[in-house]
Amino acid sequence: YPYDVPDYAGMLGSAPLVCRAGCSPEHGFCEQPGECRCLEGWTGPLCTVPVSTSSCLSPRGPSSATTGCLVPGPGPCDGNPCANGGSCSETPRSFECTCPRGFYGLRCEVSGVTCADGPCFNGGLCVGGADPDSAYICHCPPGFQGSNCEKRVDRCSLQPCRNGGLCLDLGHALRCRCRAGFAGPRCEHDLDDCAGRACANGGTCVEGGGAHRCSCALGFGGRDCRERADPCAARPCAHGGRCYAHFSGLVCACAPGYMGARCEFPVHPDGASALPAAPPGLRPGDPQRYL
């Protein structure tokens, strides 16, 4: 189920960001992958060019060089290079991060939090992270996500119910109310599909319009042809005729004055019937077998 909620969003204390290839490790840094931002006194796309301040005075580097003069660029703390809530302060040569409890490194990028610090909220279980050098992972209970299980998930927003099922997030569980013809935890099973679906007692499966039905053999009925049909249940014999179940259908024994397969035709007083002719060998009032 690729559309379902991941139970945790990764780990805290992952490796420092990978900067733009060639970015000077001594004079550049990045806040986004593939970026290269220069420390004070350095410039160029890879922060390898020392800034010359001979042409004019610049209160502070890094900068973009213009003809004959240096345009002041952002300070080393602009945009706050300190991760995880660290606070930045400028130093004569670059910057310094004051890291919150549980983080360390040049830019507070390394997590010093361990499982003993109880970083997983909302019932999350802390896995790994036995010491400050190994990162921990929070396994979050269903309904929560984030590095620390701090985010409540609207699991229905990911539309986990298939085939038009209605999603209900009960907090502790997710329910899919399936449309007619579908079943399963995510409404993934198509009950209206003939594939792998047998009709009992010699019935055949017929698909059509996104639904299936069983065309049942004579004498059987119901959704899967499992019920023995009573052909007389619907009172098919008209005008008081009596119905008899028969191995191949039903037979109507007509009341006097009526004839036909279902006793639907009155016999006229002069002996003629409403039918063009009675079937050979049959007199009015004889049982008529319904085919």
Epitope: Y1, A116, G124, L125, H172, A173
Partner: antibody
Framework: QVQLQESGPGLVKPSETLSLTCTVS????????WSWIRQPPGKGLEWIAY???????NYNPSLKSRVTISLDTSKNQFSLQLSSVTAADAAVYYC????????????WGQGTMVTVSS | EIVLTQSPGTLSLSPGERATLSCRAS???????LAWYQQNPGQAPRLLIY???SRATGIPDRFSGSGSGTDFTLTISRLEPEDFAVYYC?????????FGGGTKVEIK
């Protein structure tokens, strides 16, 4: 209320692999984590592993090299395999549902006794 | 791993008496993620308490839990005949999940 039922052989030979299956009585298998716990005769409880339908698993380090847990949502089942069994693995094995508010266990199967003997 | 030590190993009491069971952790149990279970002979354990002090569904109010950090207590205010059983604590703050060795509450 949902019910859990363990199934599998009650007798396993030493060095062989123990395979157990737990059947969940309703369609809630995608809503919870599911776990295996064992209890040797006359002793305490030991957690073995848990699994979530997204693929997340977690194993007790003391058993990790020998244990595999898997889940089949279409059958409403999850399974345990424990390889290279010894007499020390003889226990009542329980499957259990992980509570929705933390990794405690709120629904348990009745347990199945596994004996290891040649 | 966090080791849970339960005491006493056996508690002999009479029906109607108060039972106090202890569970001590080798290190801090984060966020009071501690549960208590009851197990009768030949049966599976039953969840009584989670989050150190919250009663699970259908558990009578004579059962109560307390504690934080490394020391936790299960109290049964008035023992009923069906309460004589083995009780286990379990921490679920840090993997691996661990159980205490159990306390048997028997009839005096």
């Amino acid at each position: 209320q949902v019910q859990l039922q363990e199934s599998g052989p009650g007798l396993v030979k030493p060095s062989e692999t123990l395979s157990l299956t737990c059947t969940v009585s309703d369609n809630s298998i995608s809503n919870y984590y599911w776990s295996w716990i064992r209890q040797p005769p006359g002793k305490g409880l030991e957690w073995i592993a848990y699994i979530y339908y997204s693929g997340t698993t977690n194993y007790n380090p003391s058993l990790k090299s020998r244990v595999t847990i898997s889940l089949d949502t279409s059958k409403n089942q999850f399974s345990l395999q424990l390889s290279s069994v010894t007499a020390a693995d003889a226990a009542v094995y329980y499957c259990a549902r992980v509570f929705h508010w933390g990794f405690a266990f709120d629904i348990w199967g009745q347990g199945t006794m596994v004996t290891v003997s040649s | 791993e966090i080791v849970l030590t339960q005491s006493p190993g056996t508690l002999s009491l009479s029906p109607g008496e108060r039972a106090t069971l202890s569970c001590r952790a080798s290190q801090r149990v984060s966020n009071t993620y501690l549960a208590w279970y009851q197990q009768n002979p030949g049966q599976a354990p039953r969840l009584l308490i989670y989050g150190a002090s919250s009663r699970a569904t259908g558990i009578p109010d004579r059962f109560s839990g307390s504690g934080s950090g490394t020391d936790f207590t299960l109290t049964i205010s008035r023992l009923e005949p069906e309460d004589f059983a083995v009780y286990y604590c379990q921490q679920y703050g840090t993997s691996p999940l661990t159980f205490g060795g159990g306390t048997k509450v028997e009839i005096k």
